[in-house]
Each structure stands twice: as C-alpha cells, then as structure tokens.
C-alpha cells in the first residue's frame, strides 16, 4: 500500500493532533495520520498529528523504529486515536517494523 502513487484528488483523513506542533488544535486533516514517540533527556515525548502531503510522510512512515524514535502511521479517520508508538525492546523483534496500518 505504501508504494501506491498518490491519487489526483487524494482522500483526506481527520487525525488526532497532540503535541507542540498542534498549537491549540486537537485535530488536523491530512493524507496520513501518525503517532510518534521520541526521547528527550530520558523522558518519553508522544506526539500525534497528520501529514498533509503524501510525500511528507512517505519516508517517515517507512523508517524502522530506533532506540530513540518510533513513528506509526495509518490512513483512516481518527485512526491514530488509540495508537501509542513503541520503541523497540532490546533483544526482541519489534512487531511494527513496517509501522503502517490501514483502516
């Protein structure tokens, strides 16, 4: 699914938006939704939002999780509401390596 070329009139999805980039908004509209987790001086920082342009999220969503960053992407209205990105656990295979979910 990820390698599909974007359509001329791509479908837009409503996504939960949480984090600094959201300002006072609690939602956004885009071609993909995401849920991310990064580490800032030992603390987990969770963010949710949307990629308004397909190309914007294409590489990000394909990136496998690293010890300091994980992103999960999905397509579907509010599909990122109940997604909490997880960092890979040492010595365990990480189930969401592809990090892409269709709803």
């Amino acid at each position: 699914m990820e390698d599909e070329k974007p359509k001329v009139n791509p479908k837009l999805y409503m996504c939960v938006c949480e984090g600094l980039s959201c300002g006072n908004e609690d939602h956004c509209e885009g071609q993909q939704c995401f849920s991310s987790l990064s580490i800032n001086d030992g603390f987990h920082v969770y963010q949710k939002g949307c990629f308004q342009v397909y190309e914007q999220g294409k590489m990000t969503c394909k990136t496998p999780p690293s010890p300091g960053q994980a992103v999960e992407c999905c397509q579907g209205d509010w599909c990122n509401r109940n997604i909490t990105a997880q960092l890979p656990t040492k010595g365990k295979s990480f189930p969401g390596t592809q990090n892409f979910h269709l709803e």
Partner: antibody, heavy 116, light 108 residues
C-alpha cells in the same frame, strides 16, 4: 535484567533528614528518567519526584517541594532522594522507579518512619 | 493538578467473572499518557497497561485497557485467583504526575 535496589530508610525524628539511594542495573541508566514514588501505610501510591536522564531537569510533588531534593550520579548508576524537614506524614515505603513516562520497573521499596 | 478518581473503591467478584474498573480524570488526558498498575500486599506495583490500551511485557491478554479524554477503563475478562489485588491508574500527561486512589478487587 533490570534491577532497582533502594536503601537508606529508617526511623527519624520530625524535622530530621534522611538520604535514600537507589542502585540501578540492567539498563543504560543515563538514558532514562527516574522517579521516587511513595506509599503511606495502608494508603495509595503518591508520585514524589522525577529527574531527567542527564539530571538537568527535576520535578516535585507540591507536598515535598522545598524539602526534598532528587539527584543522580550516572557514573555510579545511582538515584538519590535527600529528604529534609521530615514530617509524620512523610512516613511511607519509598520506591524508586524507572520512569521515562509510565513506571515500568520498580524497586522493592525502603521504609521511612518519621516519629518522635 | 490532574485528579484521577477511580471507581468503585472495592469490587467484590468471584473467579471467572469479568471486572470493569473505571478511572476518571478531572481534565482531558491524552491516551498515550495513561497507565494502569496492579499491586498485591507486600509487593511493589507492577505495570499492566500503558498508552491506555497497550499491554506491558508479560501481561496476560485477559487484561485490557480502553478510553480517551477523561474516561478510562481497565477490564479483566475472566478473573483468575492471582488477579485479586489493588489496581491504580496513573497519568503522566501533566506535572505533577498523579495516581488514582485505587480500586481493590476482592474475592466475593
């Protein structure tokens, strides 16, 4: 295997001081924030304080602000809680916890009793 | 601060029954920042659920979490004898981090 081992608890008089330690092993200590959580006898859990991985940021519950100081020595993989001006209501089991956000690993706890 | 109110205070059930525990926040909490713990007498708490619905490592699938905003739920689909304990919710969305007062699940 992640292990957290608290020490330093004991009986202290009101107004006294105590320093708790937590020796950590089994993970890259400096990469994770750490917390102290306490539990008074027969009561629920109360978050006390947290410190970032580098030690540069610290956070406290209002009930201990100005009296307790959290710190860490990443070269020794050890977390500390300096408790001053202790009160009877500080009597509790004190747990250290690995806590980048939620508390995924806990120590066994050390009992602090503040009584005259 | 965000106050978490758990209900009921005590839940009296028999093994095999379903347990539904509630955690209500005084203000909206992102689901990514809500966790549940189990504590048995004389033991340290154990992480069960994080991100409102993700099970921690080694937690049986009879434990599930759900909810968003101000209302969160922990469900134990079929109580096993070892599940009788006290359960706490916790938010790490805003400082100070806070716990609910706990729900005791006891044998009926």
């Amino acid at each position: 295997e992640v292990q957290l081992l608290e020490s330093g608890g004991g009986l202290v008089q009101p107004g006294g001081s105590l320093r708790l330690s937590c020796a950590a092993s089994g993970f890259t200590f400096s990469s994770y924030a750490m917390s102290w959580v306490r539990q008074a006898p027969g009561k629920g859990l109360e978050w006390v304080s947290a410190i970032s991985g580098s030690g540069g940021s610290t956070y406290y519950a209002d009930s201990v602000k100005g009296r307790f100081t959290i710190s860490r020595d990443n070269s020794k993989n050890t977390l500390y809680l300096q408790m001053n001006s202790l009160r009877a209501e500080d009597t509790a089991v004190y747990y250290c916890a690995k806590s980048a956000s939620f508390f995924d690993y806990w120590g066994q706890g050390t009992l602090v009793t503040v009584s005259s | 601060e965000i106050v978490l109110t758990q209900s009921p205070g005590t839940l009296s059930l028999s093994p095999g029954e379903r347990a539904t525990l509630s955690c209500r926040a005084s203000q909206s909490v992102s689901s990514s920042y809500l966790a549940w713990y189990q504590q048995k007498p004389g033991q340290a708490p154990r992480l069960l659920i994080y991100g409102a619905s993700s099970r921690a490592t080694g937690i049986p699938d009879r434990f599930s979490g759900s909810g968003s905003g101000t209302d969160f739920t922990l469900t134990i689909s079929r109580l096993e004898p070892e599940d009788f304990a006290v359960y706490y919710c916790q938010q790490h969305f805003r400082w100070p981090w806070t716990f609910g007062q706990g729900t005791k699940v006891e044998i009926k």
